[in-house]
Amino acid sequence: SKLKGPELSLKGTQHVTQAGQTLHLQCRGEAAHQWSLPETVSKESKRLSITKSACGRNGKQFCSTLTLNAAQANHTGFYSCKYLAVPTSKKKETESAIYIFISDTGRPFVEMYSEIPEIIHMTEGRELIIPCRVTSPNITVTLKKFPLDTLIPDGKRVIWDSRKGFIISNATYKEIGLLTCEATVNGHLYKTNYLTHRQTNTIIDVQISTPRPVKLLRGHTLILNCTATTPLNTRVQMTWSYPDEKNKRASVRRRIDQSNSHANIFYSVLTIDKVQNKDKGLYTCRVRSGPSFKSVNTSVHIYDKAFITVKHRKQQVLETVAGKRSYRLSMKVKAFPSPEVVWLKDGLPATEKSARYLTRGYSLIIKDVTEEDAGNYTILLSIKQSNVFKNLTATLIVNVKPQIYEKAVSSFPDPALYPLGSRQILTCTAYGIPRPTIKWCWRPCNHNHSEARYDFCSNNEESFILDPDSNIGNRIESITQRMAIIEGKNKTASTLVVADSRISGIYSCIASNKVGTVGRNISFYITDVPNGFHVNLEKMPTEGEDLKLSCTVNKFLYRDVTWILLRTVNNRTMHYSISKQKMAITKEHSITLNLTIMNVSLEDSGTYACRARNVYTGEEILQKKEVTIRDQEAPYLLRNLSDHTVAISSSTTLDCHANGAPEPQITWFKNNHKIQQEPGIILGPGSSTLFIERVTEEDEGVYHCKATNQKGSVESSAYLTVQGTSDKSNLE
């Protein structure tokens, strides 16, 4: 006959009892049976007793009574009674269960996670249960996602089941976070917390944290550490494959680091003790998470004994350039284990010699290379524990770009001027490694006589290489070169001698070697003006005369020549421009600006200045001339003429010196006839002297001088007596 299932004394699917009370539950069946209880109810508990007895008609049935004293809220759950030794396929007829709520107003939730949230792993698209089951079926529970969201049961996607908690049928990323079940009982709020973690198969990174390739001496221990980084909600499987895997040579340890708030780090450490040659080869760490897979490998080399080989990377003699930010001197080294590295410079430890020397692996790095870094460099390699030593030397040449010393020491802001026709010596002293060659070039100045621009010397003109026989530009006397030790360095001095300075231009000395070229320009400006700037006043004029001033400047050194008048008004000096550059006359070497003021009056007295701008410095230069216009004054004689006697055939001089403003004009008369200059009668400067050569009798008479200017005239007369007889009378 069909076996009838066991029966429980409490009917229905669920039952509520109060916490602290005793739970009685009887099971009656047709076969031997056992109880299945909630995990929280321990079968060893003193609170629990199960008594078995024969029961029913003729004592043919099996009965079992479960008694749970002082039932607690956490005893809530399924209590079931099932037959022993009955096939599971007939489970329905062999088991009876009831869900018992142990109601406790002070504990609405069976499991309370208020201190630390319970972690629940979820998979998107799958069912997710927030297991906040309650101790009484009529407790209202709210599901919240911290901080602000509330998940409302809709009977479809979100379902409330007092025996299970909240069932989310199709979980999404929205359910990731801190989920809280809240219940208010007797005005008191209770919370139980859950942290949902999305289970993913993401592998962020896999690394073997050992240098590649791994090198070991035979008999040593190999340790390889494989690290897999994943999101917090990923779990991985890590496996190794290696050369002697079949003999299970390696031991593997695993651990997980979950201290990082954003990632999990899984470690798998492979160890092989006393490695042999058979352990050399490829080691692969494979990481799998669901369908995701990543792997990383490394090569392991096993060496029988320590060794060093060292070779030059290129050649034995190396070259670099002074001024280089960094130079790496390196050797080709193969060694195991890693040797100690010491670099020597000229036999002394390099890094002790200068802080600019740094050892990096098998290289010596020289920072900010100088020519002092030239020398012999030796790498000393040693594996002391194995008594293996090697060394190798390389020579470093430091090339230096040429430098011209006159360029460095020259403090002239503007070019020197060379007097017209002078002999000049130009020198350039250069230094460099290799020793530079020096050549001289000439670039003539551009003569621009248009009024729009001043004459200038630019780099646009064609340049000519000079030799002693060159006939370009100025005549060259010689070009010589000599070696000189200056400041302890062997320098090359080249001298160009200009025999006759006639043409303005630019001489350049150019020093070159394989590193580079440097040049020095010597502006060679010829001047026919002392110091390149000269002001001239023809004469100090008197009222009514013309004032004539001229200003001459070197045309390559100055521009914008102007005459100005300086006037003092209210203790301030005012500049009045009175003549401009456009009136200037440009000549081969200079510019002259003439100033003429006709018919001057006393008011024209003052300080006249010639202003010009230095082409190189932009500075304005003034050269001043004080002009004082003299008042008109009637002539007066400094000494009157006096009678005198002169021997025939001799010569005589009559002086008539007169002052006055303007300067008086002197007129001579003899016996009231005006004297003209003729052979034998000479009028001296300004007609102030009358000179008679080889006096004759006819020269005797009254001589009279008259000094005249606009203000009047003055006269003086004297008698000249001629003594003795003439040749003619002697002949007679």
């Epitope: 901080p147 602000l148 976070g177 917090l232 708030s261």
Partner: antibody
Framework: EVQLLESGGGLVQPGGSLRLSCEAS????????MNWVRQAPGKGLEWVAT????????SHAPAVKGRFTISRDNSKNTAYVQMNSLRAEDSAVYYC????????????WGRGTTVTVSS | QSVLTQPPSASGTPGQRVTISCSGS????????VYWYQQLPGTAPKLLIY???QRPSGVPDRFSGSKSGTSASLAISGLQSEDEADYYC???????????FGGGTKLTVLG
Amino acid sequence: EVQLLESGGGLVQPGGSLRLSCEASGFDFSTYAMNWVRQAPGKGLEWVATINSEGTITSHAPAVKGRFTISRDNSKNTAYVQMNSLRAEDSAVYYCSSTTGTTHGMDVWGRGTTVTVSS
Amino acid sequence: QSVLTQPPSASGTPGQRVTISCSGSSSNIQNNYVYWYQQLPGTAPKLLIYFNSQRPSGVPDRFSGSKSGTSASLAISGLQSEDEADYYCGTWDDSLNGWVFGGGTKLTVLG
């Protein structure tokens, strides 16, 4: 690297408005709630507002309710606070913070942006 | 006036243990997790303790947190000069529906 960067602070007159922005990088911005917290000179921290991960639910401190509005644009990984009818007592350094990782506290903070309300 | 109450200052010498208290009510501390923040001078706050007693990675184990009823406390053992900072407790408040903070405690490391 997980980072928040605030901007939009400055000097504004009483009654004026400002909009602060908070740009997030280095984490899944759309999964986490965002907050604005302020700190007046020499004073303590004061919560201003919170917005849920989707931007559908907000909560504001009583002192700013009706004047300030928190919002977010998940496509731009940016949270905002629109501040209207500003008062002198709103002058502070405004920090934005997020509840990322596993802590569900304010575990990522920006450097802050200064708001000065003065005539 | 802060919703959570903290002592305004605390001090200790290097190596000492210092405790900072934080008291609230049933609507905040009692029913929610407590968080502690450290704010070094001129910087933004940094999370020090979460879920009452948990330490984020990188926070030394000298810092520990606890909660009981409506109060919480932060303990710093083996005090170091770099611990000199302002410390704030914070939690969610159910009635306010928002975060609440303590007024902050200025910790001074003496000597």
